[in-house]
Interface confidence: low
Amino acid sequence: KLTIESTPFNVAEGKEVLLLVHNLPQHLFGYSWYKGERVDGNRQIIGYVIGTQQATPGPAYSGREIIYPNASLLIQNIIQNDTGFYTLHVIKSDLVNEEATGQFRVYPELPKPSISSNNSKPVEDKDAVAFTCEPETQDATYLWWVNNQSLPVSPRLQLSNGNRTLTLFNVTRNDTASYKCETQNPVSARRSDSVILNVLYGPDAPTISPLNTSYRSGENLNLSCHAASNPPAQYSWFVNGTFQQSTQELFIPNITVNNSGSYTCQAHNSDTGLNRTTVTTITVYAEPPKPFITSNNSNPVEDEDAVALTCEPEIQNTTYLWWVNNQSLPVSPRLQLSNDNRTLTLLSVTRNDVGPYECGIQNELSVDHSDPVILNVLYGPDDPTISPSYTYYRPGVNLSLSCHAASNPPAQYSWLIDGNIQQHTQELFISNITEKNSGLYTCQANNSASGHSRTTVKTITVSAELPKPSISSNNSKPVEDKDAVAFTCEPEAQNTTYLWWVNGQSLPVSPRLQLSNGNRTLTLFNVTRNDARAYVCGIQNSVSANRSDPVTLDVLYGPDTPIISPPDSSYLSGANLNLSCHSASNPSPQYSWRINGIPQQHTQVLFIAKITPNNNGTYACFVSNLATGRNNSIVKSITVSASGTSPGLSA
């Protein structure tokens, strides 16, 4: 069937359109184009005779049309009036006619639109704004963009006038955005330049910074005010209701207590005509004095005196704090605080209570510290120590003894020999000693402040012959695999060699044996029962030698796992059952028996005469060593057979 296709269907003014013919019959005489939906000679555009290839313009020919041999019609430089239907009339050789109609629409190229507004400075929460997209164009579609996004859904946004007008009701500061409109028709689309909506708002309630409301006398007060506002707000400051200045910042140097009060910032927007204020209360505090500590006793005596430390000055509504050794106060029954924390009392002072002590005054802004105070605790003297610790000397050497006793103030020392005062010095020196210098050497330490004295006595023996040594032990009954034992060879003598023997032999090499203190001390680690031997120490110098009496180490051990004898477990009825239990243990263990879990007797031997099958069961021997605190046990099953029924042994 003969058809007409318009390419394109929608044509922009000034462009061209091709009316393309499909299914054109063969054996044609010619064809003719008409404007409209029917063949009308008055509206003929152009005719074409195939035989002569001659085109003849008709009454509707505009000079913009071109006809092609395939009957297609090109119309150039399209105008609005070209919109409509076009009919092709085909004359076949047999003079039978055929018709087809096509159409196209002509649209103008749209101009770049612009936005007009009915209110260039709308006020927030008060005004509405109507944007209109210009110009008004027929057959055009209108679109709107906010910040290059399509319109959000909002009850405050309304489109009208064929979408040509966008109305924003009750504008807010958030409506301050870029607005664009767009016009579209089938042949073109144009977007306007952006229009920025300038919403007048504020001022909001101003904020005053910094938030700090407490100041010290002598500081600078520098307050800044800010309120969200368009256009920017104008600021005024009032102090206690009195106008000060029209600035955003308020600066008062070197403030005093008199500057305390209410500070008001007023923000004004000249365009909206609105005012908003914020008030802050500023408190200026007088600078407190630096605290200091007083004491009721500057030289307390250890274990006798109490000391009360008071934080000065006394200030009402003030918190007092204390520190000892730069730490907060430890919990101690010897430390007491008064109700207001101003007085710290140390009951029964010790030498460790020297401090330093600090007190602090806490006010609204800070904590002020006192200077540290150190207590002068009087103590001692403790028992003096005399060094060196030697008690035996050879004739001809120098004797030099030194005495020391912990004391505050430092002790005064005196030396006595056999009760006779010698000298008031800390050191005693005697050159080229003889046997006559043997005796009791006493050091006396005296604390002049406390009036206390302490003495220590040392026996000095001057002899060419060494004395018979003895062995002292730190543990007379060590427990096996648990305790260590330290043997010390007495006395301590100058220029002396110490030797040890075990069971008459020199010391074996063992990681459990250690010599120390110039070989004077022999330590046995983790003792075993095999260490229960005879230990002898010896001392020797260039002129003599001597050995101690032996000391036997009594090692507590066990009880080991007990053994029940005889080993038999099968018996004949009528025999006597005689079980003996033994466990290696020092001291000997306590024994007890249980038969089938029932306690029996506390003996080493269990005897039952004329047993019967009723005596079948488990026989348990329990052993315990009260010295080591250890226990052990063993269980034996006994079977008693009726006479003649099974082989067995009789006891």
Partner: nanobody, 120 residues
Framework: EVQLVESGGGLVQAGGSLTLSCTSS????????MGWYRQTPGKQRDLVAD?????????NYAGFAQGRFTISRDNIKNTVYLQMNDLKPEDTAVYYC????????????WGQGTQVTVSS
């Protein structure tokens, strides 16, 4: 003598973050209102933020620090912190911590401070 040690400063780009720490081996912070201060060359030290003694329930900030900086304290660790977000070139300064909230001149001893440099 009180010794305060600030740390955590450094070079950071605008918009970045830093956390400053302050501790002392000679001063127990718990009973003190503690503050962070900053100083640029030729200017006085300015209070940045402060935190109340004990549990630190009350915090105050200078206008420029509001919303960007956070002060906190850990009494167990005897440490005060200043978390600084969205740093700006104008935040470049030496930052100090101390007792004494507002009366800057009265603090007994200042630490070495920690340098914060914000590059654009």
């Amino acid at each position: 003598e009180v010794q305060l040690v600030e740390s955590g400063g450094g070079l950071v780009q605008a918009g970045g973050s830093l956390t400053l720490s302050c501790t002392s081996s000679t001063l127990t912070f718990t009973p003190y209102r503690m503050g962070w201060y900053r100083q640029t060359p030729g200017k006085q030290r300015d209070l940045v933020a402060d935190i109340s003694p004990g549990d630190g329930s009350t915090k105050n900030y200078a206008g420029f620090a509001q919303g960007r900086f956070t002060i906190s304290r850990d009494n167990i660790k005897n440490t005060v912190y200043l978390q600084m977000n969205d740093l700006k070139p104008e935040d470049t300064a030496v930052y100090y911590c101390n007792t004494y909230v507002a009366f800057v001149g009265r603090a007994r001893t200042w630490g070495q401070g920690t340098q914060v440099t914000v590059s654009s």
